[in-house]
Interface confidence: medium
């Protein structure tokens, strides 16, 4: 999906008002310095591409993020403010339904959510030069 036509300001507002708090709740008890940020993004559409990938694509050691509150709200924000996004998800959803995973918070998931926090922070500061 091409995130170029999203309403970035509305997505930013949703992040600041609620998604950020859910990410903090998920990471509670973890030191902010515990994980290094290894995933980066260069502009807002790129950030949303990376955020979608890390939030919804199962990875080795962390298959359960899609069930989390921050993930549901991320999906809602993309559906509401990115035209045509919902349609790209219909087939993917039907495949996902066949492989439900148990909800387990692993160290790998915490690391992944730490990366998400970094991507979201970058999304909110699009004019900063890439490090």
């Amino acid at each position: 999906y091409d995130f170029t036509n999203c309403d970035f300001e509305k997505i930013k507002a949703a992040y600041l008002s609620t998604i950020s708090k859910d990410l903090i709740t998920y990471m509670s008890g973890t030191k902010s310095t515990e994980f290094n940020n290894t995933v980066s993004c260069s502009n807002r559409p790129h950030c949303l591409t990376e955020i979608q990938s890390l939030t919804f694509n199962p990875t080795a050691g962390c298959a359960s993020l899609a069930k989390e509150m921050f993930a549901m709200k991320t999906k809602a924000a993309l559906a509401i403010w990115c035209p045509g996004y919902s349609e790209t998800q219909i087939n993917a959803t039907q495949a996902m339904k066949k492989r439900r995973k148990r909800k387990v918070t692993t160290n790998k998931c915490l690391e992944q959510v730490s990366q998400l926090q970094g991507l979201w922070r970058r999304f909110n500061r699009p004019l900063l030069k890439q490090q």
């Epitope: 509305k10 949703a14 008002s17 609620t18 899609a66 069930k67 993930a71 549901m72 709200k73 999906k75 809602a76 924000a77 559906a79 509401i80 403010w81 035209p83 045509g84 919902s86 349609e87 998800q89 219909i90 993917a92 959803t93 996902m96 339904k97």
Partner: antibody
Framework: QVQLVQSGAEVKKPGSSVKVSCKAS????????ISWVRQAPGQGLEWMGN????????NYAQKFQGRVTITADESTSTAYMELSSLRSEDTAVYYC?????????????????WGQGTLVTVSS | DIQMTQSPSSLSASVGDRVTITCRAS??????LTWYQQKPGKAPKLLIY???SLQSGVPSRFSGSGSGTDFTLTISSLQPEDFATYYC?????????FGQGTKVEIK
């Protein structure tokens, strides 16, 4: 199974306001949006606006901008549609509908569950 | 706002007929299209979402096709309970607009 139950019929004077409620049961209220759609006698369907309780965000059809306010009370799983400065052309059946689901498994933009409709008559 | 134009506005058909209703969007909406059936005095019923996905519980004689600007709802073999008004609706940017409706009447 989600159900939407709307408030009863209303008769209003021109220039006044009406507030119609839509109570949801049987699902997670914040995991979907609520749309409001109206239908004047013998006419087609007209979308008025959506509310997304998950963010407390509402968007409206241009035609109704400034005259309609859609709100949601998550504690009672109820959505409200208030239309002000009523005129005779606002006489219609007003429907609420579940619009899209944003749960773990993504749904779609269809309005798949509808309230029974509320007839609002505007007459002097 | 995106305009949706349905054709025909009404049609007469017999039980067993194949019926086709078309819907045209004023701009590209990908597959962000739904079809509804409405009977007099009742709320609309969702038939098709995402242009071609059949809503759960809807008979397989209903099908949808198209993408971009041109869409079609087909009833392969019209049944007595299918006489109703049909509406298309786009939701490309979550500001949905409906077509004006197609009334399917008994010939």
């Amino acid at each position: 199974q989600v159900q939407l139950v709307q408030s009863g019929a209303e008769v209003k004077k021109p220039g006044s306001s009406v507030k119609v409620s839509c109570k949801a049961s049987g699902g997670t209220f914040s995991s979907y949006a609520i749309s409001w759609v109206r239908q004047a006698p013998g006419q087609g369907l007209e979308w008025m606006g959506n509310i997304y309780p998950i963010f407390g965000y509402a968007n409206y059809a241009q035609k109704f901008q400034g005259r309609v306010t859609i709100t949601a009370d998550e504690s009672t799983s109820t959505a409200y549609m208030e239309l002000s400065s009523l005129r005779s052309e606002d006489t219609a059946v007003y429907y609420c509908a579940r619009y899209g689901q944003y749960g773990q498994h993504f749904s779609h933009g269809g309005m798949d569950v509808w309230g029974q409709g509320t007839l609002v008559t505007v007459s002097s | 706002d995106i305009q949706m134009t349905q054709s025909p506005s009404s049609l007469s058909a017999s039980v067993g007929d194949r019926v086709t209703i078309t819907c045209r969007a004023s701009q590209d909406i990908s597959i962000s299209l739904t079809w509804y059936q409405q009977k007099p005095g009742k709320a609309p019923k969702l038939l098709i979402y995402g242009a071609f996905s059949l809503q759960s519980g809807v008979p397989s004689r209903f099908s949808g096709s198209g993408s971009g600007t041109d869409f079609t709802l087909t009833i392969s073999s019209l049944q007595p309970e299918d006489f109703a008004t049909y509406y298309c609706q786009q939701f490309y940017f979550h500001s949905p607009t409906f077509g004006q409706g197609t009334k399917v009447e008994i010939k």
